[in-house]
């Protein structure tokens, strides 16, 4: 006999990276008929929602109107149908950005390179941080981490056209508090030959989300995105 229900999905809208003082909604999708959803933050109960009517709703939203460093961290959710509880969702890392300072991102040998050329990004921030993050716009949200006192190196190795795109970096004051994003750097990769065996796991990011949302000063900018697996967000573990 089943002792628990399947775990729900958890994600953040419009994004799991939220500028300080902006709004974010944490979504939890379970099953129709769930009478209660609980949102847990850093292992403790954070909020409860009881959908009405439960048989017509399989998703709830927890609204955070004013993001700050105290709200940044790991969230998970569970739901209940009758007396039976679900497994907990995967962890959602909610990150507060636009904290303190803005790093500088540069790329060597330059923003335009030949397919097969070795490329390295450099993220520099003169204030106290030792962890840096490099992100690329795209479909998944793999984030590269680098370390250094004021600057981190991100060697991409020999690049292919798969590396083309717009990159930004952040300084990280802790796992869930990041700086403002750097100015974007657009990497162009040209070359008549492309060897797919050199193609890396593409360090990409949801294309039209973070570039606009992270930099906007309009609090009302909200974008609805199709559900994407929260596991892509679990970059920090």
């Amino acid at each position: 006999q089943q002792q628990t229900l399947p775990k729900p999905f958890i994600w953040a809208e419009p994004h799991f990276m939220v500028p300080s003082a902006k709004q974010v909604t944490i979504c939890c999708q379970g099953n129709y008929g769930a009478v209660e959803y609980q949102l847990h933050f850093e292992g403790s109960l954070f909020a409860v929602d009881r959908p009405k009517p439960p048989e017509r709703i399989n998703k709830v939203k927890f609204y955070i109107p004013d993001m700050n460093s105290r709200m940044a961290g790991q969230y998970s959710c569970i739901y209940r149908v009758g007396e039976l509880w679900s497994e907990p969702s995967n962890l959602l890392d909610l990150v507060v950005t636009a904290m303190y300072d803005t790093p500088t991102l540069s790329v060597h040998p330059g923003p335009e390179v030949i397919s097969g050329e070795k490329v390295t990004f450099y993220c520099r921030l003169d204030t106290a941080t030792s962890m840096f993050l490099l992100l690329k716009e795209g479909r998944s949200s793999h984030v590269q981490r680098g370390y250094g006192k004021v600057q981190a190196e991100f060697p991409l190795g020999p690049v292919t056209t798969a590396h083309r795109g717009t990159y930004r970096c952040f300084g990280s004051y802790n796992n869930h508090a990041w700086s403002f994003p750097s100015e974007p750097v657009k990497l162009l990769v040209t070359g008549d030959i492309e060897n797919t065996s050199l193609a890396p796991e593409d360090p990409t990011f949801p294309a039209d989300t973070w570039g606009t949302y992270l930099l906007t000063t309009e609090t009302g900018l909200q974008k609805d995105h199709a559900l994407w697996d929260h596991t892509a967000q679990n970059l920090l573990r």
Epitope: S106, P109, E112, V113, G116, K118, P158, I193, E194
Partner: antibody, heavy 116, light 107 residues
Framework: EVQLQQSGPELVKPGASVKISCKTS????????MHWVKQSHGKSLEWIGG????????SYNQKFKGKATLTVDKSSSTAYMELRSLTSEDSAVYYC?????????WGQGTTLTVSS | DIVMTQSPATLSVTPGDRVSLSCRAS??????LHWYQQKSHESPRLLIK???QSISGIPSRFSGSGSGSDFTLSINSVEPEDVGVYYC?????????FGAGTKLELK
Amino acid sequence: EVQLQQSGPELVKPGASVKISCKTSGYTFTEYTMHWVKQSHGKSLEWIGGISPNIGGTSYNQKFKGKATLTVDKSSSTAYMELRSLTSEDSAVYYCARRGGSFDYWGQGTTLTVSS
Amino acid sequence: DIVMTQSPATLSVTPGDRVSLSCRASQSISDYLHWYQQKSHESPRLLIKYASQSISGIPSRFSGSGSGSDFTLSINSVEPEDVGVYYCQNGHSFPLTFGAGTKLELK
């Protein structure tokens, strides 16, 4: 010590082709792209194009597409540039240069003279 | 294509002078700007990379500054062996382009 040793001067007739070599030593050939630069007498420098030795990816200045072909031989750590359908306008000194960000090492230059 | 404009075309100097060579890009190239020196009948030699980064083996009297579209190569006390042509190069976008050069000569 990094060295780029180019082939000697060439005197060729109009309409002919020529292949200039650039033999490298002192570093891992496949780790840097190799570029070619033209310098006509008393003039500035013109970038012809570059090639990544590891996979042979190339990028050309539009002006030299159809004129220059860049290749490499990884086994001998040598880069080549072939110039075809030569005219007097192609008479110049041609340099190979390693791109380590900037062009940090240059060959000694190959003088090409196109004359009938 | 990014056009690199150097000025002056020729600079007549006396040993010991401090001189500044200018390079302007037709659009912003951030700090992807490199400087080369070419002496008569020699290959170009890298002097400064990424606008201001010094190169091992290059005398400390050579320095670079600037970002965006305006750049300067400075020689704080010219030596007779500094005579030659100085080129700036766009390292930002293909085609990679060079300035027409500034000829440094002794008075």
